[in-house]
Interface confidence: low
């Protein structure tokens, strides 16, 4: 009969290296009599016999982990006890060897130029993987701006446009290499104007091209503003190449203005904007008429048809390529500006503008335009349209127009001939369908000029003669 014998572990446990999802086995060979009871612990916690992840065989001497997980690493011990003497224990470590695995891969990033970008790349693996980065097809070199952090993440300080591109992280250890998917680092750049539009001083009716070039990422959009409002006329062409947008605004100039090019691009929910402005001013209408050549012809337009005398000859200025069209376009532009003026001012202003743009013409060897008499001009300015005139001059002072009344082609009253000096040298305005009683209700106006400048016309004319040729429409 055998003698009882205390357990002896003849094959101590060794360190076991195992790959994830592979099988790992610890052997705990025991000699004893009677047969010992063998139990297993992991990190001092008893492994339950019914845990299906494990297989215990050979009377408990073989412990097999059927599919190793990275969480299985630790210290495994076998304890043998048969009641004879004390229990014996042998321990060994399970080192879960793991091919590199990227647990938090990088993601596409949009970052504004100059800020800091971090592309994550958290890895697992045993041995611990080393992490490197590839940009495009080349290994990324670290420098003062670019560093791979201990965590594996890529940090780029002061992001530059050239940092944009496709990146992937590479995790490598002795068991293998893992690559992340390609991710895109997009460097967004605030909209910036590379080429601002140039200011122009042109004659009425000429074409001007304003050009504005802007850069940004994403490519900016360019819009044009005319005197604070969206451009109402003109042709806009634009093209995009290499993140640069080039916009050309082509204008037919009938009035001066401040044109602003606005380049805008979007960064997430925010927008960046860059602006550049140019002025387009018109060489003075009165100057363009000085020493001008022209011809006398019947007025065939529409705008002034009700204002000008029927079949009257008016002067057309041949300094314009198409005088009749040009002058009609100018009066049409002016007419639109008059929509907002008072009912008292409007007919007076219409008559003044029409007779100024389409001056009575004396045919002869040299066709000669006859300007409006100064007194009538002053009456419109200081009586009928005093408020409007002041408002318009206010706009000029604020710098929107180069000088004076350039928004409307109004004459400079002081430069016009007086009807008192030579009644035949100037044109009277047979206009204003107002009766004498309306005139007498004018508010008192404090004139900025001596009252002697205000026309002193016969009382029977209600200050102005009513022409049968003029009718309000």
């Amino acid at each position: 009969e055998k003698l009882p014998k205390a357990p002896v572990i003849t094959t101590p446990l060794e360190t076991v290296d195992a790959l994830v999802e592979e099988v790992a086995t610890f052997m705990c060979a025991v000699e004893s009599y009677p047969q010992p009871e063998i139990s297993w612990t992991r990190n001092k916690i008893l492994i339950k016999l019914f845990d299906t992840r494990y297989s215990i065989r050979e009377n408990g001497q073989l412990l097999t982990i059927l599919s190793v997980e990275d969480s299985d690493d630790g210290i495994y011990c076998c304890i043998a006890n048969n009641g004879v003497g004390g229990a014996v224990e042998s321990c060994g470590a399970l080192q879960v060897k793991m091919k590199p695995k990227i647990t938090r891969p990088p993601i596409n990033v949009k970052i504004i130029e100059g800020l800091k970008a971090v592309l994550p790349c958290t890895t697992m693996g045993n041995p611990k993987p080393s992490v490197s980065w590839i940009k495009g097809d080349n290994a990324l070199r670290e420098n003062s701006r670019i560093a791979v952090l201990e965590s594996g993440s890529l940090r780029i300080h002061n992001v530059q446009k050239e940092d944009a591109g496709q990146y992937r992280c590479v995790a490598k250890n002795s068991l293998g290499t893992a690559y992340s998917k390609l991710v895109k680092l997009e460097v967004e750049v605030f909209a910036r104007i590379l080429r601002a539009p140039e200011s122009h001083n042109v004659t009425f009716g000429s074409f001007v091209t304003l050009r504005c070039t802007a850069i940004g990422i994403p490519v900016p959009t360019i819009s044009w503003i005319e005197n604070g409002n969206a451009v109402s006329s003109g042709s806009i062409q634009e093209s995009v190449k290499d993140r640069v947008i080039d916009s050309r605004l082509q204008l037919f100039i009938t009035k001066p203005g401040l044109y602003t090019c606005i380049a805008t691009n979007k960064h997430g929910e925010k927008f960046s904007t860059a602006k550049a402005a140019a002025t387009v001013s018109i060489a003075e209408w009165s100057k363009s008429q000085k020493d001008s050549q022209g011809y006398c012809a019947q007025y065939r337009g529409e705008v002034c048809d009700a204002v000008l005398a029927k079949d009257a000859l008016v002067f057309f200025n041949t300094s314009y390529r198409d005088p009749e069209d040009a002058q009609e376009l100018l009066i049409h532009t002016a007419w639109n500006e008059l929509k907002a003026v008072s009912p008292l001012c409007r007919p007076a202003a219409e008559a003044l503008l029409c007779n100024h743009l389409f001056q009575e013409c004396s045919p002869g060897v040299v066709p000669t335009p006859m300007p409006i008499c100064r007194e009538y001009c002053l009456a419109v300015k200081e009586l009928f349209c005093a408020k409007e005139w002041q408002a318009m001059e206010g706009k000029a002072h604020r710098g929107l127009y180069r000088s004076g009344m350039h928004l409307l082609p109004v004459p400079e009253c002081s430069k016009l001939p007086s009807m008192h000096r030579d009644p035949t040298a100037c044109t009277r305005l047979p206009y204003l369908d107002y009766k004498k009683e309306n005139i007498t209700t004018f508010p008192s106006i404090t004139s900025s000029r001596p009252s002697a400048d205000i026309p002193n016309l016969p009382a029977s004319t209600s200050s102005f003669a009513v022409s049968p040729a003029y009718s309000m429409t």
């Epitope: 062409q237 634009e238 093209s239 290499d242 080039d246 082509q250």
Partner: antibody
Framework: EVQLVESGGGLVKPGGSLRLSCAAS????????MHWVRQAPGKGLEWVSS????????YYADSVKGRFTISRDNAKNSLYLQMNSLRAEDTAVYYC??????????????WGQGTLVTVSS | DIQMTQSPSSLSASVGDRVTITCRAS??????LNWYQQKPGKAPKLLIY???NLQSGVPSRFSGSGSGTDFTLTISSLQPEDFATYYC?????????FGQGTKLEIK
């Protein structure tokens, strides 16, 4: 490949009319300004007319204003020039040209082979 | 309209010569200036755009310079295929005026 093919030229009497066509292919016609340029026999190039991509703006040389009309049909990728009240001095080879506007001043980067218009009694 | 004046109107030169053609605008046109080459019976061909930019596919012996009103087309070393008529064109205004042309002939 960008291709512009003019047609519609021929002999016409003074005062008569003619309609030129230009068929475009190989590019997105509807996004380009297009032009007509002519060249009288033995003479230099003379720009005739232009039309913006969506027909909003049309321009004409002084010599043809009021007589010629430019138009386009983007659905058909076609450019047209309707010529009325033709004169002997309108005799020329008429070219259609594409206006390439890309980061720089416009330029006519593609031309058709031209179609000859002869105005003679 | 903007007038474009080319000089000379004709020019005789030999293969290998350096040739310069000038173009003057009647008003400042910034760099809105293009150069074209035309051979008999053919459509014009764009050489230079924006005063100094070489059109794709054009040999580098062609170059352009200038800004404002005065512009120059230079052929650094004439080749047999360069004998043709050259036109400048302004694209600053929608009249797109051409110069009268410079005919380059073999000496």
């Amino acid at each position: 490949e960008v291709q512009l093919v003019e047609s519609g030229g021929g002999l016409v009497k003074p005062g008569g009319s003619l309609r030129l066509s230009c068929a475009a292919s190989g590019f997105t016609f509807s996004t380009y300004t297009m032009h007509w340029v002519r060249q009288a026999p033995g003479k230099g190039l003379e720009w005739v007319s232009s039309i913006s991509s969506r027909s909003a703006y049309k321009y004409y040389a002084d010599s043809v204003k009021g007589r010629f009309t430019i138009s386009r049909d983007n659905a058909k990728n076609s450019l047209y020039l309707q010529m009325n009240s033709l004169r002997a001095e309108d005799t020329a080879v008429y070219y259609c040209a594409r206006d390439f506007f890309q980061l720089g001043p416009p330029r006519f980067d593609s031309w058709g082979q031209g179609t000859l218009v002869t105005v003679s009694s | 309209d903007i007038q474009m004046t080319q000089s000379p109107s004709s020019l005789s030169a030999s293969v290998g010569d350096r040739v310069t053609i000038t173009c003057r605008a009647s008003q400042r046109i910034s760099s809105f200036l293009n150069w074209y080459q035309q051979k008999p019976g053919k459509a014009p061909k764009l050489l230079i755009y924006g005063a100094s930019n070489l059109q794709s596919g054009v040999p580098s012996r062609f170059s352009g310079s200038g800004s404002g009103t005065d512009f120059t087309l230079t052929i650094s070393s004439l080749q047999p295929e360069d004998f043709a008529t050259y036109y400048c064109q302004q694209s600053y205004s929608p009249s797109y005026t051409f110069g009268q042309g410079t005919k380059l002939e073999i000496k």
